[in-house]
């Protein structure tokens, strides 16, 4: 806490001065009006203050604004946005992404930190849903943004917003979430040709039910070991040596190095031994020729 | 009253280092910003570089930047300039100077006598 | 970077006239100028800072004034003590203390 002191002569501030980097805090405190401060918060981020002076500023700022600051503040905070505590950011009405933006680019290039997500979390709620330009907005400062969230918070994403979407923006989700994607995707995509539609949904394919990846197998697509790999085992077990080649194409080869990695062993335990040997890979662990397979599930259903 | 006394001049070899020191009294040390300001044979004055009273922020003509390094240490009122790499264009008077401001104002309020450094081989 | 010009170089006047010291600024200086006074084989000294403000124990006969790109040290009356080079000089963070060439005020 800055102690209350008068402020010396000559130096009560009219504006917000790059003289001011002198000031020690007690004379930031006392020679620095916080209604000037407020309105000129743009100029505060093109003087080099130090931590200890943006802490007498934040504090300046907190008396005027106890109930939260206004976003023709938050707008402008700059750097000093870093001094705030997810606390502080609670109390903020964040309704532009213009500054929401203002405020990614101070910790752009940084790992997501707690005020942040705090801020986001503020903004979204508030929207009610990811929009398109927010998604986009975010995606662009955090890839793993999309990732982070939950299945029940996806749900809220409105499929025009997955043209946002760039396939680094998915590396780190997991089957629930593109669970939650894939539908979305599928139907954000549906009036594009079969080229251009793969090229689009290739990223989301990991939340593909069976049916899904059946009919990609017929329009020659040529899916990647990479994307195959992050197929749902359960479905991609259903699929038959035939559909497999013809959904991998030129890259069916790869199967042969991936052969001990699910969802490949797991399908390839399901595959008929001389169905395999039709790749001509060398796969090994398919079911003996001359051995029933009983589909048990369906056994089931019928009793 | 307020007294500044430098010492440390000499004379160097181009490429040499020599720091300069300041014995500041009279005065709380630790509450004003310090600066160097040198002063070439019968040129006008130039300012070499300035740091603050808590050394958070130091700044540097781009003259000597990357070759001088200006320090201070509060407990023995004392400031610092280590001078790397000279060349005979840093032969001056180094004045140690005391840093004042007012709002949009900032000058130097006192000054030592200065100390001479001449870079000759 | 800004750069102050001070005119006349030398100005050579008796004792008791009036002396009218120009520094001009190559761009609008935000902040205030400070004056110096340097005698030879002294240090500067500082007369006028923040433009217009006298320094502890300058005389009245001292005076500073301008702003923007224009500044002025006037000397209502020349002492014989006030023959000497007068120094301008502002602080930016673009520019730190900037000084100008300086200008000699000799005994005609």
């Known amino acids: 806490e800055v102690e209350k002191t008068a402020c010396p002569s000559g130096k009560k501030a009219r504006e917000i001065d790059e003289s001011l980097i002198f000031y020690k805090k007690w004379e930031l405190e006392a020679c620095v009006d916080a209604a000037l401060l407020a309105t000129q918060m743009d100029r505060v981020n093109a003087i080099p203050f130090t931590y200890e002076q943006l802490d007498v500023l934040k504090h300046k700022l907190d008396e005027l604004y106890p109930q939260g600051y206004p976003e023709s503040v938050i707008q402008h905070l700059g750097y000093l946005f870093l001094k705030m505590s997810p606390e502080d950011i609670r109390k903020w009405n964040v309704t532009s992404l213009e500054t929401l933006k203002a405020l990614l680019e101070v910790n752009k290039g940084h790992e997501m930190s707690p005020q942040v997500a705090t801020l986001i979390d503020r903004f979204v709620k508030g929207r009610g849903q990811l929009d398109k330009d927010t998604l986009d907005t975010l995606t662009a400062f955090y890839p793993g943004y999309l990732c982070s969230l939950s299945p029940e918070e996806l749900s809220s994403v409105p499929p025009s917003s997955i043209w946002a979407v760039r396939p680094q923006d998915l590396d780190t989700c997991d089957p629930r979430q593109l669970d939650v994607l894939y539908p979305k995707a599928r139907l954000a995509f549906q009036n594009m040709n079969g080229s251009e539609y793969f090229v689009k949904i290739q990223s989301f394919l990991g939340g593909a039910p069976t049916e899904d990846l059946k009919a990609l197998s017929q329009q020659n697509v040529s899916m990647d070991l990479a994307t195959f790999m992050k197929l749902r085992t359960d479905a991609v077990l259903p699929l038959t040596v035939a559909e497999v080649q013809k959904l991998l194409g030129p890259h069916v080869e790869g199967l042969k190095a991936e052969e001990r990695h699910r969802p490949v062993r797991d399908w390839i335990l399901r595959q008929r031994q001389d169905d395999l040997d039709t790749l001509g890979l060398g796969l090994q662990g398919g079911i003996p020729n001359g051995y029933l397979v009983l589909d048990l599930s369906m056994q089931e259903a019928l009793s | 009253q307020v007294q500044l006394v430098e010492s440390g001049g000499g004379l160097v070899q181009p490429g040499g280092s020599l720091r300069l020191s300041c014995a500041a009294s009279g005065f709380t040390f630790s509450d004003y910003a310090m600066s160097w300001v040198r002063q070439a044979p019968g040129k006008g004055l130039e300012w070499v570089s300035a740091i603050m009273y808590d050394s958070s922020s130091t700044f540097y003509a781009d003259s000597v930047k990357g070759r001088f390094t200006i320090s201070r240490d509060n407990s023995k009122n004392t400031l610092y300039l280590q001078m790397n790499s000279l060349r005979a264009e840093d032969t001056a008077v180094y004045y140690c100077a005391r840093i004042n401001y007012i709002y949009k104002g900032v000058h130097f309020d006192y000054w030592g006598q200065g100390t001479l450094v001449t870079v000759s081989s | 970077d800004i750069v102050l010009t001070q005119s006349p170089a030398t100005l050579s006047l008796s004792p008791g006239e009036r002396a009218t010291l120009s520094c001009r600024a190559s761009q609008i200086v935000s902040g205030y100028l400070a004056w110096y006074q340097q005698k030879p084989g002294q240090a500067p000294r500082l007369l006028i800072y923040g433009a217009s403000s006298r320094a502890t124990g300058v005389p009245a006969r001292f005076s500073g004034s301008g702003s923007g790109t224009d500044f002025t040290l006037t000397i209502s009356s020349l002492e014989p003590e006030d023959f000497a080079v007068y120094y301008c000089?502002?602080?930016?963070?673009?520019?730190?203390?900037?000084f100008g060439q300086g200008t000699k005020v000799e005994i005609k």
């Open positions: 000089q502002q602080w930016s963070l673009r520019s730190p203390f900037t």
